[in-house]
């Protein structure tokens, strides 16, 4: 069937438009376009003759329409009268008519739109919007944006007039947005520039800034005042209901206690005509002076006195606060504060306690330190120490000993040889010693300030001969995997070398051995079973050698995986059944039995007589060393057979 | 047989104005529309204005200022007039027939502007 | 408006050598194309319309081509009588306008 698709159906004006036919006859005369649904001889766009492959105009024929051979019809340089029916009229060669009618629309191109509107300062909660999309258009459907985004539903927007209204109403500040209005045809879409709204609103309860209520007498007063409005809002500034200037910043240098009172800020919008105050309270304080420490004992014996520390001056309604060592105060038994927390009292003191300590005064703007104040702890002597450590010296030598012993004030020292006073220095020098010089070495130490002596006696022995040495250890029962053990050679001899054996053979090279002290200490890390030895240590110098006694090792171990012996699982009824348990362990470990998880006895040997099928079942020995801590256990399973 | 034939003054004084007569014979003014185009000495052919058969028209965009084109449907007339002539408007000056292509043409009529 | 541009304002040729003449329009012109030959001292003559249809009693050895913006009139063995200017038109639009020519010389 002869039939006509127009491409495209919506045309825009000044665009074109094929009206394209479909399944045209064959052995055709010609063909005719009109316009309209019907053949009218007065609305003949063109003819065209295939014998001629001529076209014809007819009346209604304006010059832009071309009529290709296929009898196409193209419409060029479309206005909006070309909307309508075109009907094709084609004549066969046997003069036998077929007719066929299709149709197009012709729409604007639209033009950029804009937005009108009846309200260009409209006033918040008070105020609506009326914004108009222009120009009018028909057959135009009309959209509208609001910050790029469709209009939000709320029930205060109403779109009227076919949409091409867009009312705000009840306005609020959150509606000052961008709003477009676009309009659309089958042919184009255009959309408006951004109209912006400005809403005018405010002025909001105004904020004062800082937040700040208190000030210290001679500092400056700097208060800043905002509200939110639309236009900016106009400030002024009453001081207790005065007036005082007309601007959003009050500044009032160097205050005193006089401009204590109420600061009210005022905003005003003089578009919307509305006033808000803001009041706050200023309170402006006397400087208060700078605190400091007295104490009720300057010079406290360790261990003896107690020492309170108040922070002055006394002053009404003040807090106090301390702090020890640039920190606040330790939590302490020994450390007791005052109710109103002025007072803080040190509890038997020690020679840690000496500060320094700092008070504070803590008003509404800021806390006032005191001078750090360090406490003279008095104590000592402690036990004075004599060194070198030497106990035995060649003779011909030079002997300097020297004492120390902590003490405040620092300690007077004397020195005494086999009780008699030797002199009143902290050295004691006496050049090239005999043997007469064998004996008893006494250091006094005496704290003037306490009343207190402490002594310390070393026995210096002066002879060619070095002494026989002995083993001294920091460990003598270490448990296996887990101990250390250090040996240490006695005595510290001076200019002596100190050799090791062990079970009289010199030492392995063990990565679990070290030496040190120069070589006057051997330390055995990790020790095992292995190391329950023999050790001896031997001192030599140019003129005489020794060896100490052997220590043994006494290595704590175990208990290991015990085993029950016989190895028999399988009795008969009728026989004696005679375990034994044994567990590598030192000391020798507790023993206990179990028969199916029932204990037994704490023996070494579980004996029954006579077993019967009834003795069936698991037999469990269980080991514990009570030194080492450790435990350990074997099942056996035994079969009686009848 | 389908005869068309112009006919004009011949030489014209620059700034005077032009009328070409188009005389057609074997078809019918309302069936064929007329087209003008002249062809300057040793140029190209250049498209002028047509008149359709209902009697509107279409100009050449650059001489629609001088130019007018109208008929008799009853003396098989089509008239070219132009006004304000300069020498450059020197060409032969055919009318043919046909609304796209042109498959009927005068033998052209030559016109020399110049005082 | 639309413009013709033949690109060659002569070609020279041989008789019995096949020719092809161009022509390119400044839009798509949906094969509303003409071509015409006009020979020394004469009136032009339409070969061609809508861009391949040769017109009653053209020789078959003329034949057109193209489509969109370019147009070709092929003489697939050029005759001694074919010496003549050869120009493009298209009808797409109003104003109708014609390509410059393209002069065929015999060597």
């Known amino acids: 069937k002869l039939t006509i698709e127009s491409t495209p159906f919506n045309v825009a004006e000044g665009k074109e438009v094929l009206l394209l036919v479909h399944n045209l006859p064959q052995h055709l005369f010609g063909y005719s376009w009109y316009k309209g649904e019907r053949v009218d001889g007065n609305r003949q766009i063109i003819g065209y003759v295939i014998g001629t492959q001529q076209a014809t105009p007819g009346p209604a024929y304006s010059g832009r329409e071309i009529i290709y051979p296929n009898a196409s019809l193209l419409i060029q340089n479309i206005i909006q009268n070309d909307t309508g029916f075109y009907t094709l009229h084609v004549i066969k060669s046997d003069l036998v008519n077929e007719e066929a009618t299709g149709q197009f629309r012709v729409y604007p191109e639209l033009p950029k739109p804009s937005i009108s509107s009846n309200n260009s300062k409209p006033v918040e909660d008070k105020d609506a919007v009326a914004f108009t999309c222009e120009p009018e258009t028909q057959d135009a459907t009309y959209l509208w944006w609001v910050n790029n985004q469709s209009l939000p539903v709320s029930p205060r927007l109403q779109l009227s007039n076919g949409n091409r209204t867009l009312t705000l109403f009840n306005v609020t500040r959150n509606d000052t947005a961008s709003y477009k209005c676009e309009t659309q045809n089958p042919v184009s879409a255009r959309r408006s520039d951004s109209v912006i709204l400005n809403v005018l609103y405010g002025p909001d309860a105004p904020t004062i800034s800082p937040l700040n209520t208190s000030y210290r007498s001679g500092e400056n007063l700097n208060l800043s005042c905002h509200a939110a409005s639309n236009p900016p809002a106009q400030y002024s500034w009453f001081v207790n209901g005065t007036f005082q200037q007309s601007t959003q910043e009050l500044f009032i240098p160097n205050i005193t206690v006089n401009n204590s009172g109420s600061y009210t800020c005022q905003a005003h919008n003089s578009d919307t005509g509305l006033n808000r105050t803001t009041v706050t309270t200023i309170t402006v304080y006397a400087e208060p002076p700078k605190p400091f420490i007295t104490s009720n004992n300057s010079n406290p014996v360790e261990d003896e006195d107690a020492v309170a520390l108040t922070c002055e001056p006394e002053i009404q309604n003040t807090t106090y606060l301390w702090w020890v060592n640039n920190q606040s105060l330790p939590v302490s038994p020994r450390l007791q504060l005052s109710n109103d927390n002025r007072t803080l009292t040190l509890l038997s003191v020690t020679r840690n306690d000496v500060g320094p300590y700092e008070c504070g005064i803590q008003n509404e703007l800021s806390v006032d330190h005191s001078d750090p104040v360090i406490l003279n702890v008095l104590y000592g002597p402690d036990d004075p120490t004599i060194s070198p450590s030497y106990t035995y010296y060649r003779p011909g030598v030079n002997l300097s000993l020297s004492c120390h012993a902590a003490s405040n004030p620092p300690a007077q020292y004397s020195w005494l040889i086999d009780g008699n006073i030797q002199q009143h220095t902290q050295e004691l020098f006496i050049s090239n010693i005999t043997e007469k010089n064998s004996g008893l070495y006494t250091c006094q130490a005496n704290n003037s300030a306490s009343g207190h002596s402490r002594t310390t006696v070393k026995t210096i022995t002066v002879s060619a001969e070095l002494p026989k040495p002995s083993i001294s250890s920091n460990n003598s029962k270490p448990v296996e995997d887990k101990d250390a053990v250090a040996f240490t050679c006695e005595p510290e001899a001076q200019n002596t070398t100190y050799l090791w054996w062990v079970n009289g053979q010199s030492l392995p090279v063990s990565p679990r051995l070290q030496l040190s002290n120069g070589n006057r200490t051997l330390t055995l890390f990790n020790v095992t079973r292995n190391d329950a030895r023999a050790y001896v240590c031997g001192i030599q110098n140019s003129v005489s050698a020794n060896r100490s006694d052997p220590v043994t090792l006494d290595v704590l171990y175990g208990p290991d995986t015990p085993i029950i012996s016989p190895p028999d699982s399988s009795y008969l009824s009728g026989a004696n059944l005679n375990l034994s348990c044994h567990s590598a362990s030192n000391p020798s470990p507790q023993y206990s039995w179990r028969i199916n998880g029932i204990p037994q006895q704490h023996t070494q040997v579980l004996f029954i007589a006579k077993i019967t099928p009834n003795n069936n079942g698991t037999y469990a020995c269980f080991v514990s060393n009570l030194a080492t801590g450790r435990n350990n256990s074997i099942v056996k399973s035994i079969t009686v057979s009848a | 047989q389908v005869q068309l034939k112009e006919s004009g003054p011949g030489l014209v004084a620059p700034s005077q104005n032009l009328s070409i007569t188009c005389t057609v014979s074997?078809?019918?003014?309302?069936?064929?529309?007329i087209n003008w185009v002249r062809q300057p000495p040793g140029k190209g052919l250049e498209w002028l204005g047509i008149?359709?058969?209902?009697?509107?028209?279409n100009y050449n965009s650059a001489l629609k200022s001088r130019l007018s084109i109208s008929k008799d449907n009853s003396k098989s007339q089509v008239f070219l007039k132009m006004n304000s002539l300069q020498t450059d408007d020197t060409a032969r000056y055919y009318c043919?027939?046909?609304?796209?292509?042109?498959?009927?043409w005068g033998l052209g009529t030559t016109l020399t502007v110049s005082s | 408006d639309i413009v013709m541009t033949q690109s060659h304002k002569f070609m020279s040729t041989s008789v019995g050598d096949r020719v092809s003449i161009t022509c390119k329009a400044s839009?798509?012109?949906?094969?509303?194309v003409a071509w015409y030959q006009q020979k020394p001292g004469q009136s032009p003559k339409v070969l061609i319309f809508?861009?391949?249809t040769r017109h009653t009693g053209v020789p078959d050895r003329f034949t057109g081509s193209g489509s969109g913006t370019d147009y070709t009139l092929t003489i697939s063995s050029v005759q001694a009588e074919d010496l003549a200017l050869y120009y493009c038109?298209?009808?797409?639009?109003?104003?109708?306008?014609f390509g410059g020519g393209t002069k065929l010389e015999i060597k």
């Open positions: 074997g078809f019918s003014l309302t069936s064929y529309a």
């Open positions: 839009q798509d012109v949906t094969t509303a």
């Open positions: 038109q298209q009808y797409y639009r109003t104003p109708r306008t």
């Open positions: 008149i359709w058969t209902g009697g509107g028209t």
């Open positions: 043919a027939s046909g609304v796209y292509y042109f498959d009927y």
């Open positions: 809508w861009a391949s």
